[in-house]
Amino acid sequence: MAVTACQGLGFVVSLIGIAGIIAATCMDQWSTQDLYNNPVTAVFNYQGLWRSCVRESSGFTECRGYFTLLGLPAMLQAVRALMIVGIVLGAIGLLVSIFALKCIRIGSMEDSAKANMTLTSGIMFIVSGLCAIAGVSVFANMLVTNFWMSTANMYTGMGGMVQTVQTRYTFGAALFVGWVAGGLTLIGGVMMCIACRGLAPEETNYKAVSYHASGHSVAYKPGGFKASTGFGSNTKNKKIYDGGARTEDEVQSYPSKHDYV
């Protein structure tokens, strides 16, 4: 029971996490204009991994995609790559984990196979979560570096009468979504790995021993304790290591695309 619950919960948590990673990757608000020096700006800038946007006080919003590939900073390319790798690994992990779920029966699949698939998906979720956390952290570090650089520039060369305010950027909503989503995916992966251990206990086969009693010859053959799917008609002499209960619930969380435009 505990194993199935752990596996199911790990799957759901990872699903939510991956949906969050997809949402964060698509979001435009990775960095938002810092309003500390100009809280009453009539023009608000924010940027994502794929495009930058300007929202005017009039309500008009204009977004422009980064149509160049070579002209983009290497760090941004790296963040994009990390997020995409995270999504791909997470998606594959989800696909594998669906077949690995103990509550889903596919043919006469052995529990050892399900255990291997659970471990595989768990590792994929862990790597996916780490990719997302790394991607978001690299971007955040880039923002912090640029923020202090632009702050230094802002207070130098202001001898003239005309003041040119340099736009500074701070953390956007997508960073927090990414961190949380990455963390959830990581936790889900760990839960899947824990569930894997309970799914595949080592087989302990006891040799058949014959006890000869006078008058009767009765052979006691204790069946080897073996993990089973419980699938099929003959379940005699089989100990099912899932506590007997199964959940048929499938919790689905669809990736939501947050459009801030």
């Epitope: 100009n38 700006t41 930058s52 005017e56 006080s57 309500g59 008009f60 305010v165």
Partner: antibody, heavy 118, light 113 residues
Framework: EVQLVESGGGLVKPGGSRKLSCAAS????????MHWVRQAPEKGLEWIAH????????YYADTMKGRFTISRDNAKNTLFLQMTSLRSEDTAMYYC???????????WGQGTSVTVSS | DIVMTQSPSSLTVTAGEKVTMNCKSS????????????LTWYQQKPGQPPKLLIY???TRESGVPDRFTGSGSGTDFTLTISSVQAEDLTVYYC?????????FGAGTKLELK
């Protein structure tokens, strides 16, 4: 055709109050931010206040803050300007205007005149 | 607050002449996010409300004759009328659309020589 018609102007005593209205037609009022701008006789344009399409964001000129209140009723397609503690220097033609891209004011009403005098 | 300074305050011209008026802001109106300058030009005829001519410093509003051209970037802007017509002899205002409070220049008045 876009139309903005101001009303509520007139003669007011110093320290008095007045509520100006701006009736909008010919466009989806609830989609646009709106502004009040005034012009004293033989003087230039002076911005008063801005209200966003859903009334979530409001800005005032420092000199008018606390005395003037901008509001809107999207159901009635009407913009308002409540003016209190009026002074002689508030004598002007009051215009309402529609806010569009580029943070520009593309359509203006004909204006309503407010005279503050004892 | 951003201070808008227009020059000259008045300009005497003849019909058909090319006219240039200036507007200077105390702070840059160039937005780095879209590389657009948030400066607007208006024309106001006596007894009428202002009319939008140009926004984003150089984008002509629909219906505005192409003899009106806006230019400039950062803090220095210009409105040029390539061939002045009689109906153009009125007052022109520039406006900051970059930050609140939205501020207007004192205006440039075009008069017939």
């Amino acid at each position: 055709e876009v139309q903005l018609v101001e009303s509520g102007g007139g003669l007011v005593k110093p320290g008095g109050s007045r509520k100006l209205s701006c009736a909008a037609s010919g466009f989806t009022f609830s989609d646009y931010g709106m502004h009040w701008v005034r012009q004293a006789p033989e003087k230039g344009l002076e911005w008063i206040a801005h209200i966003s399409s859903g009334s979530s964001t409001i800005y005032y000129a420092d000199t008018m803050k606390g005395r003037f209140t901008i509001s809107r009723d999207n159901a009635k397609n009407t913009l308002f300007l409540q003016m209190t503690s009026l002074r002689s220097e508030d004598t002007a033609m009051y215009y309402c205007a529609r806010f569009v891209r580029g943070n520009a004011l593309d359509y203006w009403g004909q204006g309503t005149s407010v005279t503050v005098s004892s | 607050d951003i201070v808008m300074t227009q020059s000259p305050s008045s300009l005497t011209v003849t019909a058909g002449e090319k006219v240039t008026m200036n507007c200077k802001s105390s702070q840059s109106l160039l937005n780095s996010g879209n590389q657009k300058n948030y400066l607007t030009w208006y024309q106001q005829k006596p007894g009428q409300p202002p009319k939008l001519l140009i926004y984003w410093a150089s984008t002509r509003e629909s219906g505005v004759p192409d003899r009106f051209t806006g230019s400039g970037s950062g803090t220095d802007f210009t409105l040029t009328i390539s061939s002045v017509q009689a109906e153009d002899l009125t007052v022109y205002y520039c406006q900051n659309g970059y930050s609140y409070p939205l501020t207007f220049g004192a205006g440039t008045k075009l008069e017939l020589k």
